[in-house]
Amino acid sequence: GSERTCCPVNWVEHERSCYWFSRSGKAWADADNYCRLEDAHLVVVTSWEEQKFVQHHIGPVNTWMGLHDQNGPWKWVDGTDYETGFKNWRPEQPDDWYGHGLGGGEDCAHFTDDGRWNDDVCQRPYRWVCETELDKASQEPPLL
């Protein structure tokens, strides 16, 4: 396949990535699947600059990102290293809070209304952001 040179319609370009901002909500797994079907992934935040960009577009609304600890350690969906990477948790988060009646632990990360991150029950129907890299080879065959 050929490399993408511009973002799909209704996606926003920023720093060689394309972003799509939902206007409805889905559980984390459904949001993750939606992005994959678009040949993308839930947003992976790698810098303060990218954090500010995403925050500007989502506003003060709880929004899923591509970070979870459903299998133990925190992991970014694209394989970006969590331990050495950018983090922007709210104070005392993540707490993987189990002491509630909300169906197990809090295994999925989201942007809160002030942009900082919190871990929450993955079933909540939050909005979400998909991201895909412009340099990634597209699935479309090259034009002859």
Partner: antibody
Framework: QVQLVQSGAEVKKPGASVKVSCKAS????????INWVRQATGQGLEWMGW????????GYAQKFQGRVTMTWNTSKSTAYMELSSLRSEDTAVYYC???????????????????WGQGTTVTVSS | DIQMTQSPSSLSASVGDRVTITCRAS??????LGWYQQKPGKAPKRLIC???SLQSGVPSRFSGSGSGTEFTLTISSLQPEDFATYFC?????????FGPGTKVDIK
């Protein structure tokens, strides 16, 4: 037993604000959501939003965005809903309801509002 | 927002009757739907979650079915204490939305 007890009836003038309280007992307050739902006389139920005292998260229905604020005092196990710029259409009974995700074996999670307050009547009249 | 509609808006029935109430969603909500019962002057009470799962303590004459956009609440044999208003609630997306309600009264 688990219960939510709400503050008493209020009469307010248009343009004013009202703050309704909801005191939880019989369970760990920070372990569940609190939802706020209202019902005008003879009308249906209208979901206003939710808050979670553990995470600090809140979510408001767009219709009330900018006019509603949901807060809580953990030490008092009490949730509050404040509605500002009141108009006559805000005359209603306001309910708080405990919410959580219930697990059905093999079927995922489903949200339930299992315990409700007795309701607080708010009348807006000049 | 997801719109919920209910039919009928009211119905008259006798004790022992089989009663069916329908709730429709404006888009696919899978089975993210609950049914609530409300009596005059009282707070709502949960009956069914996940479209078909009976809450503990709720009599077995109540049942729910459906998924996607169409859902049904059935009372197999109406009892005197069942005369009330019934609401559906979707929790598939924020804002959660209730149906307008179905009032069941005595014929």
């Amino acid at each position: 037993q688990v219960q939510l007890v709400q503050s008493g009836a209020e009469v307010k003038k248009p343009g004013a604000s009202v703050k309704v309280s909801c005191k939880a007992s019989g369970y760990t307050f920070t372990s569940y959501d609190i939802n706020w739902v209202r019902q005008a006389t003879g009308q249906g139920l209208e979901w206003m939003g939710w808050m979670n005292p553990n995470s600090g998260n809140t979510g408001y229905a767009q219709k009330f965005q900018g006019r509603v604020t949901m807060t809580w005092n953990t030490s008092k196990s009490t949730a509050y809903m404040e509605l500002s710029s009141l108009r006559s259409e805000d005359t209603a009974v306001y309910y708080c309801a405990r919410g959580f995700y219930d697990t059905l074996t093999g079927s995922g999670y489903y949200y339930v509002m299992d315990v409700w307050g007795q309701g607080t009547t708010v009348t807006v009249s000049s | 927002d997801i719109q919920m509609t209910q039919s009928p808006s009211s119905l008259s029935a006798s004790v022992g009757d089989r009663v069916t109430i329908t709730c429709r969603a404006s888009q696919d909500i899978r089975n993210d739907l609950g049914w609530y019962q409300q009596k005059p002057g009282k707070a709502p009470k949960r009956l069914i979650c996940a479209a078909s799962s009976l809450q503990s303590g709720v009599p077995s004459r109540f049942s729910g079915s459906g998924s996607g956009t169409e859902f049904t609440l059935t009372i197999s044999s109406l009892q005197p204490e069942d005369f009330a208003t019934y609401f559906c609630l979707q929790h598939n997306d924020y804002p959660f939305t209730f149906g307008p309600g179905t009032k069941v009264d005595i014929k």
